[in-house]
């Protein structure tokens, strides 16, 4: 079945053309195109081909990457790259890059604010709730998946001949050494930010000195703050802000108004970044393939860990998330999933999952006919606190660092695994550098060696990639899961008391004047000829 | 019980080559690592390696790579330590220790001991 | 590598004494800290792993403690089998190291 297309108030398909350069569906029968329908004519083709061009575009460039990438590593001679030249080829990526991590701050920002400030106090909770116990399930479920596999497939015994290469010495300084306790308290401080200016770029981490006291030299907690935005701080404190906003009830009216206003300009933007995207998606993933030094060896060395991560992701991604949609929804996930190949594509090529929240929270609005506020409420904390494929990754590398250095792994272990991993990519988006740390923290967790984390960060690149394309794949089909959620206690309820969207109906409304009104929105004439209502605002659910 | 008994001592000269045995009982050979370490005449112990032993593959410290071999007969649960090219400062009592299979790196049970001495 | 300082190199004790044998790291090694007993002619035994667990086997008079880089063994009353060369052994990160060790002789 096709994906439900946004509707106005009236239940209508909504027909007014959005602000993405074209890539709105000007149909019905377009739409069930763009969502994977089926193209039978000449005429059709076209018009399947036109509503999903971006999508093909960034597949393509995806494709294109990798041949660019094996065409220019391949050919080594006047076109092998040195690292001047290097940082030149991929700078198209980077661009695409800087422009996304440009957005990620307004949006995440102004999203959750409108967002909380949108939904009365409850729905919000009870929308929280079920979002977080989605991210729960789903995150212990991709944790038993990853240990499963790892421990059926046996990578390091496969793999335990890297050992004698990398040598005995292994390469423990990479690993991060850090108290478990230390990392959950950064993560609670990274969650409540001393100064919210700082914490669009600074996040705080706890380092170590040592330090003589009578005579012993003691190892004493040091606490400072390190490059990378505090993306957890900011969403905590832009929740508990909209929470605030709604609660002035008319004084906070105008400035609720400003959120959704800003987010709408900022999504605008995002359209335009989307046409970009193909291009840099292209020279990110042909740029990492040309900086590795012998990836034949490395997957020859690492392949059977290298094939139970991706393995793992790709049956948790096309199997287990999609199995759970339908079971809750009964609707095609892979229909959905269709609606979300260009942000799936990018989380590919940045390896990153707040970048591609921009380009997530426009597809799925637009292809997946997911609320606004049910978007932009949960995709940002989906992107802060929902790590499938991070999770699968690190209980895969925990066993494969067990069976390569021949540590047995009894029930209570296997269980710790499971949990540590589930807690800490939970809150891995609150600890700077991440994965690896998170990963040495579930090591420590089970009395691991993390000598071989090294050889974990070898493949990164690409195991990396995988996982930010599971992980922002759970935070869509969450949303997905969340709106057929409201569409289903609404449709039971006499009176939809779930939601109301603040912008729309003010409490005290003000009067918007033509030339003053926001220019992103279309005013239609009320009964009384008042041009309050804005037809592009979702209505009350 | 857990046991591992090492072959006798060895009496070789310079260059010759020797092959050391460590015969494994009283456990599940394939499930711990098993590893070599050195005690030169006088002097501390001296950690040289391990073999994997479901996997069969060696892992050599950066002072014992080149010379030094580790292989396993898993079908009579022992494994062996062959030094080519041996020389003077090869003398030195080699035992192996079965490496736990928790807590990272520690040894729970040793081999006798093989006293080896290069003389001409 | 990580160093491994014993101290001190040796000793001399009645029986029935409590003797204390120091091992110190270069680096934080995390509890992971064992300690192995060798006599003359004979192969190391581990007496204690990961700082303070006991050895199957090995009596309770023997105790291990501390953290970070700095670690003790203790044996709360000598018995003439105890008078032995004691080593430690880091088992943090590869590749493995032993301290010097530390000869106990019977005063």
């Known amino acids: 079945m096709v994906a439900d297309p946004p509707r106005d108030s009236k239940g209508l398909a909504a027909a007014e053309p959005t602000a993405n350069g074209g890539l709105a569906l000007a149909s019905i029968e377009d739409q069930g195109a763009a969502a994977g329908g089926y193209c039978g004519s000449r005429d059709q083709v076209r018009r399947c081909l036109r509503a999903n061009l971006l999508v093909l575009l960034t597949v393509v460039a995806v494709v294109a990457g990798v041949a660019l990438g094996l065409g220019v590593s391949g050919a080594g001679g006047a076109l092998a790259l040195g690292p001047e030249r290097l940082s030149a080829f991929v700078f198209p990526g980077e661009l695409l890059l800087r422009l996304l991590r440009m957005i990620i701050l307004p949006l995440v920002v102004c999203s959750l604010i409108g967002g909380a400030a949108s939904l009365d106090p409850g729905a919000l909770g009870r929308l929280g709730a079920w979002a977080l116990l989605f991210f729960l399930v789903t995150t212990l479920l991709a944790s038993a998946l990853g240990v499963g596999l790892a421990l059926a497939l046996q990578p390091g015994a496969a793999s335990a001949a890297i050992n004698a290469s990398v040598g005995a010495a292994g390469s423990a300084e990479n690993a991060p050494s850090k108290e478990v306790l230390d990392s959950f308290l950064d993560l609670a401080r990274n969650i409540f930010p001393s100064n919210l200016v700082s914490a669009a770029f600074r996040s705080y981490s706890t380092t170590y000195e040592e330090r003589n006291i009578t005579g012993t030299r003691v190892k004493v907690p040091v606490g400072q703050e390190v490059e990378g935005m505090n993306i957890l701080g900011l969403v905590v404190f832009a929740i508990v802000f909209g929470v605030a906003l709604r609660k002035l009830g008319p004084e906070g009216e105008l400035l609720i108004r400003f959120f959704n206003s800003f987010n709408e300009a900022t999504m605008v933007l995002v359209s335009w970044i989307m046409w970009y995207a193909p291009v840099g998606i292209m020279f990110l993933v042909a740029g990492k393939i040309v900086e590795m030094e012998d990836v034949g060896l490395l997957f020859a060395r690492l392949g059977k860990y290298i094939l139970c991560c991706l393995l793992g992701h790709a049956i948790h991604g096309l199997l287990v998330l999609p199995l759970i949609y339908f079971l809750f929804t009964r609707k095609n996930p892979y229909r959905f999933l269709w609606g979300i190949v260009t942000p799936l594509a990018t989380a590919f090529g940045t390896s990153s999952s707040s970048a591609t929240l921009p380009l997530m929270m426009k597809c799925v609005e637009e292809n997946n006919g997911v609320a606004k506020h049910i978007s932009r409420f949960i995709l940002p904390i989906g992107a802060t606190v929902n790590m499938d494929g991070a999770a699968l990754f690190q209980c895969v590398a925990a066993v494969f660092i067990a069976q390569l250095s021949q540590q047995s792994l009894d029930f209570v272990k296997i269980i710790t695994i499971l949990v540590t991993a589930t807690a800490s990519s939970v809150g891995a988006a609150g600890i700077p550098a991440g994965g690896v740390l998170t990963l040495a923290i579930i090591l420590e967790a089970v009395n691991l060696p993390v000598d071989h984390i090294s050889l974990i960060l070898a493949v990164d690149w690409l195991v990396d990639r995988s996982c930010t394309v599971l992980n922002v794949e759970g935070d869509a089909l969450g949303a997905g899961l969340l709106q057929n959620y409201v569409d289903r206690t609404e449709s039971r309820s006499t009176e939809p008391e779930l939601i109301q969207v603040k912008s729309e109906l003010p409490l005290d409304p003000l009067p918007v004047p033509t030339e003053e009104g926001n220019p992103l929105l279309k005013h239609y004439r009320g009964p009384a000829g008042d041009a309050t209502v804005a037809s592009e605002k979702e209505s009350v659910m | 019980q857990v046991q591992l008994v090492q072959s006798g001592s060895e009496l070789k000269k310079p260059g010759a080559p020797v092959k050391i045995s460590c015969k494994a009982s009283?456990?599940?050979?394939?499930?711990?690592?098993m590893s070599w370490v050195r005690q030169a005449p006088g002097q501390g112990l001296k950690w040289m390696g391990w073999?994997?032993?479901?996997?069969?593959?060696?892992i050599y410290g950066d002072d014992f790579k080149g010379r030094f071999v580790f292989s396993l007969d898993t079908s009579v649960s022992t494994a062996y330590l062959q030094i080519s090219s041996l020389k003077a400062e090869d003398t030195a009592v080699y035992f192996c220790?079965?490496?736990?299979?928790?807590?990272?790196?520690?040894?729970?049970?040793w081999g006798q001991g093989t006293t080896l001495t290069v003389s001409s | 590598d990580i160093q491994m300082t014993q101290s001190p190199s040796s000793l001399s004790a009645s029986l029935g004494d409590r003797v204390t044998i120091t091992c110190r790291a270069s680096?934080?090694?995390?509890?992971?800290l064992n300690w192995y007993q060798q006599k003359p002619g004979k192969a190391p035994k581990l007496l204690i792993y990961?700082?303070?667990r006991l050895h199957s086997g090995v009596p309770s008079r023997f105790s291990g403690s501390g953290s970070g880089t700095d670690y003790t063994l203790t044996i709360s009353s000598l018995q003439p089998e105890d008078f032995a060369t004691y080593f430690c052994?880091?088992?943090?990160?590869?590749?493995?190291?032993f301290g010097q060790g530390t000869k106990l002789e019977i005063k």
């Open positions: 220790a079965r490496r736990s299979d928790n807590y990272r790196y520690f040894f729970d049970y």
């Open positions: 009283g456990y599940t050979f394939s499930t711990f690592g």
């Open positions: 073999i994997h032993t479901y996997a069969g593959v060696p």
């Open positions: 680096q934080d090694i995390r509890n992971y």
């Open positions: 990961y700082t303070s």
């Open positions: 052994q880091q088992g943090h990160t590869l590749p493995p190291t």
